[in-house]
C-alpha cells in the first residue's frame, strides 16, 4: 500500500512503499563488524576507459502523486564523523584462503585500487548529498518506468551472492531518465547495516539511513554490461533510502519473507514476479542526480546515479529481517555492506526540484545555489 507523499520543500521526506531491492550491478561484499577508518580514493585521474576493469510491450507510465508525510532535515540525527566505526573502509579484504584479490570486502587488504584501478578514480560513489548545494535543474523531468509491474509467472531468481541479496530482472523493464536517455533494468540489490547501525550507501548531510535499494540499469545504447562499463551514461542506478515506519511494507515483504531460504552464501530461490516499481518511492519527480561509479570493484565510472528525495518505509521487523538473516563468506553475517562516501572532487549534484530553498535547518544565512549544468543532456 502507498503511504502519503512528502511535502514539496522537504528533501528526503516521508516514505512510500517500495518493492524489494535485490542486488544491483555492484556485487556487494559482506562487511566486517570491526571498527574501520574512512579511506577515500586518491586524487589521481581515473584510468582511461580501456583500462577499466570488469562489475521490452510497454505498459503505461505509472503516475506518482499522492501527498506524503514530511521528514525535515532538522529531524535527522547528527552527522557521523569520518572514521566513525560505522564507516566501512574503501578497501578489499584478504579472504580466508589467504588469496590477495580473489574475494574482497569492505575493510582489510588489499586496497580496492589494487583489485581494480578504477576504484582510485576521482568520480566515485557513493557520495554525501547536501541539498543546500544541489543545483536545481528544471530540465530534469519525472522518471518514466515502463513494464515494471511483473506478473507472478514466470518467477524471478533471488540470490544471496555473499555480498548482498540480488533479484535478477527479466527483459522488458524500461526506464527513461529523460528524452533519449533510455535504459533497461537488469537487477535489484540492497545495502544495509546491522542492529542499531544504519547501512545506506549514500548519506544526506552526513546522515546514514537504515538501508538503500539500488535498481541497476543498462543504457539501450549497449547490448551488454561489459560494453557499458566506464562509458559515460552506460549504466544508471536508481537509489532510494529505506527507513523505519509503523507499518509492514507489503511489497518488500514478498522478498524479505524468502530470505531465510537463502540464508547461506551462494544459495538462491525463485520468487513470484511482483510490481518492481512498488519497491521504490511513489514520487518520481523529485530526485538528486550525479555521475559516479559502481560502489564496489570494478568501481567503473560513468554511472548515472538518481537518488530519490522520497524515502521508502519498512517496519522495524522488516529492517531487522534484512540485516539479520543472511550469511556471507567465512561464516560471517552479511551485514554493513556499504562503501564509505567518496569525495565529490568538483562534481555538482543536480536536483529536479529546488532542494536548496527553505529546506535546511541552517537556512538563516544566504546560500549560494549552484546553477544547473547541462541538465537533460
Amino acid at each position: 500500500q502507498r503511504l502519503p507523499r512528502m511535502q514539496e520543500d522537504s528533501p528526503l521526506g516521508g516514505g512510500s512503499s517500495g518493492e524489494d531491492d535485490p542486488l544491483g550491478e555492484e556485487d556487494l561484499p559482506s562487511e566486517e563488524d570491526s571498527p574501520r577508518e574512512e579511506d577515500p580514493p586518491g586524487e589521481e585521474d581515473l584510468p582511461g576507459e580501456e583500462d577499466l576493469p570488469g562489475e521490452e510491450d510497454l505498459p503505461e507510465v505509472k503516475p506518482k502523486s499522492e501527498e506524503e508525510g514530511s521528514l525535515k532535515l532538522e529531524d535527522l540525527p547528527t552527522v557521523e564523523a569520518p572514521g566513525d566505526p560505522q564507516e566501512p573502509q574503501n578497501n578489499a579484504h584478504r579472504d580466508k584462503e589467504g588469496d590477495d584479490q580473489s574475494h574482497w570486502r569492505y575493510g582489510g587488504d588489499p586496497p580496492w585500487p589494487r583489485v581494480s584501478p578504477a576504484c582510485a578514480g576521482r568520480f566515485q560513489s557513493p557520495v554525501d548529498i547536501r541539498p543546500q548545494l544541489a543545483a536545481f535543474c528544471p530540465a530534469l523531468r519525472p522518471l518514466e518506468l515502463l513494464g515494471f509491474q511483473l506478473p507472478p509467472l514466470p518467477e524471478l531468481r533471488l540470490r544471496n551472492n555473499g555480498h548482498s541479496v540480488q533479484l535478477t530482472l527479466p527483459p522488458g523493464l524500461e526506464m527513461a531518465l529523460g528524452p533519449g536517455r533510455e535504459y533497461r533494468a537488469l537487477q535489484l540489490h540492497l545495502h544495509w547495516g546491522a542492529a542499531g547501525r544504519p547501512g545506506s550507501e549514500h548519506t544526506v548531510e552526513g546522515h546514514r539511513f537504515p538501508a538503500e535499494i539500488h535498481v541497476v540499469h543498462l543504457s539501450t545504447a549497449f547490448a551488454r554490461v561489459d560494453e557499458a562499463l566506464g562509458r559515460p551514461g552506460g549504466l544508471a542506478v536508481l537509489a532510494a533510502f529505506l527507513e523505519e515506519g509503523p507499518e509492514e511494507n507489503s511489497a518488500y515483504e514478498q522478498l524479505l519473507s524468502r530470505l531465510e531460504e537463502i540464508a547461506e552464501e551462494g544459495s538462491e530461490t525463485q520468487v513470484p514476479g511482483l510490481d518492481i516499481s512498488a519497491l521504490l518511492p511513489s514520487d518520481f519527480s523529485r530526485y538528486f542526480q550525479y555521475e559516479g561509479s559502481l560502489t564496489t570493484p570494478p568501481c567503473a565510472q560513468g554511472v548515472i546515479w538518481t537518488v530519490f528525495n522520497q524515502t521508502v518505509m519498512l517496519s522495524a521487523k522488516q529492517l531487522h529481517t534484512l540485516s539479520d538473516t543472511l550469511w556471507g563468506p567465512g561464516d560471517s553475517r552479511l551485514q554493513l555492506n556499504f562503501r564509505a562516501t567518496q569525495p565529490l572532487n568538483g562534481r555538482v549534484i543536480e536536483a529536479s526540484f529546488p532542494a536548496g530553498v527553505d529546506s535546511s535547518p541552517r537556512a538563516a544565512e544566504p546560500v549560494q545555489l549552484n546553477s544547473c549544468l547541462a541538465a537533460g543532456d
Epitope: 580501456e50 577499466l52 570488469g54 562489475e55 551488454r224 554490461v225 561489459d226 560494453e227
Partner: antibody
Framework: EVKLEESGGGLVQPGRSMKLSCVAS????????MDWVRQSPEKGLEWVAE??????????HYAESVKGRFTISRDDSKSSVYLQMNNLRAEDTGIYYC????????????WGQGTTLTVSS | QIVLTQSPAVMSAFPGEKVTMTCSAS?????MHWYQQKAGSSPRLLIY???NLSSGVPARCSGSGSGTSYSLTISRMEAEDAATYYC?????????FGGGTKLEIK
C-alpha cells in the same frame, strides 16, 4: 532444472547443408539470448552465432568464419533454437553446443551436451 | 578480436595444494568468465563477472583480476578439480575463449 538438448549432427560432405536443433526446458526460453558455440581440437572453443529476443527483433550475430553460410533462428513457442548450416567446410567439423546467455550479460550459463558434426568427403 | 592467452597450458597439483592459472587478454576487458570442462562432458560455468561463483561451485574456487590480467585460483586441490579450464570475454564481438589450462592431479 535447466536443460538444453541438441540434435541434428552427423557426417556430411563438404558443400552440403545441415540443420542443428536445440530444445530447451526448465526456464522461460523467451527471456534469454541463445548462442551456438563449437569445439574442435584445432580451434578449441569458438563462438558461432547468437540470437536475441523478440523485443530485440530477434537480432542475430555471427562469427566471421560462418557469416553468410550459417543462419540462427528461434521459435519461442517451441522453446527451440536452430542453426542452419550451408556450404559446409571441413573446418566446420566439431562438437556444437547450444548455450543460454542471460540477456545483457557476457557469459554462457548453461550448455547442452553437444552434437557432433563431421564434414568430410 | 580480443585474443585470450591462458597459462600454463598444462599443470598438475597434489591434493590440498593451491593452484593458480592465468588468462591474459590482448586488450582490456571489463569482466572475465571461467568454465570447467571435464573429459567427455560439456563446459560448465564456474565463475562469472571475474569473481562471482556460479551456483554449486565450491568456495575453494575464486577468480580475480582486472584490465588485461585475470586469474583463477583453487585454494585446495581435490580430485574432482581435475579438468580443463577456459577463460572467456565478451567486451566486444566476437566473444572469445582462451586455449585452456589442463589441470591434472598428481
Amino acid at each position: 532444472e535447466v536443460k538444453l538438448e541438441e540434435s541434428g549432427g552427423g557426417l556430411v560432405q563438404p558443400g552440403r547443408s545441415m540443420k542443428l536443433s536445440c530444445v530447451a526446458s526448465g526456464f522461460t526460453f523467451s527471456y534469454y539470448w541463445m548462442d551456438w558455440v563449437r569445439q574442435s581440437p584445432e580451434k578449441g572453443l569458438e563462438w558461432v552465432a547468437e540470437i536475441r529476443l523478440k523485443s530485440d527483433n530477434y537480432a542475430t550475430h555471427y562469427a566471421e568464419s560462418v557469416k553468410g553460410r550459417f543462419t540462427i533462428s528461434r521459435d519461442d513457442s517451441k522453446s527451440s533454437v536452430y542453426l542452419q548450416m550451408n556450404n559446409l567446410r571441413a573446418e566446420d567439423t566439431g562438437i556444437y553446443y547450444c548455450t543460454r546467455a542471460p540477456h545483457y550479460y557476457g557469459y554462457f550459463d548453461y550448455w547442452g551436451q553437444g552434437t557432433t558434426l563431421t564434414v568430410s568427403s | 578480436q580480443i585474443v585470450l592467452t591462458q597459462s600454463p597450458a598444462v599443470m598438475s597439483a597434489f591434493p590440498g595444494e593451491k593452484v593458480t592459472m592465468t588468462c591474459s587478454a590482448s586488450s582490456s576487458v571489463g569482466y572475465m568468465h571461467w568454465y570447467q570442462q571435464k573429459a567427455g562432458s560439456s563446459p560448465r560455468l564456474l565463475i562469472y563477472d571475474t569473481s562471482n561463483l556460479s551456483s554449486g561451485v565450491p568456495a575453494r574456487c575464486s577468480g580475480s583480476g582486472s584490465g588485461t590480467s585475470y586469474s583463477l585460483t583453487i585454494s585446495r586441490m581435490e580430485a574432482e578439480d581435475a579438468a580443463t579450464y577456459y577463460c572467456q570475454q565478451w567486451r566486444s564481438y566476437p566473444p572469445t575463449f582462451g586455449g585452456g589450462t589442463k589441470l591434472e592431479i598428481k
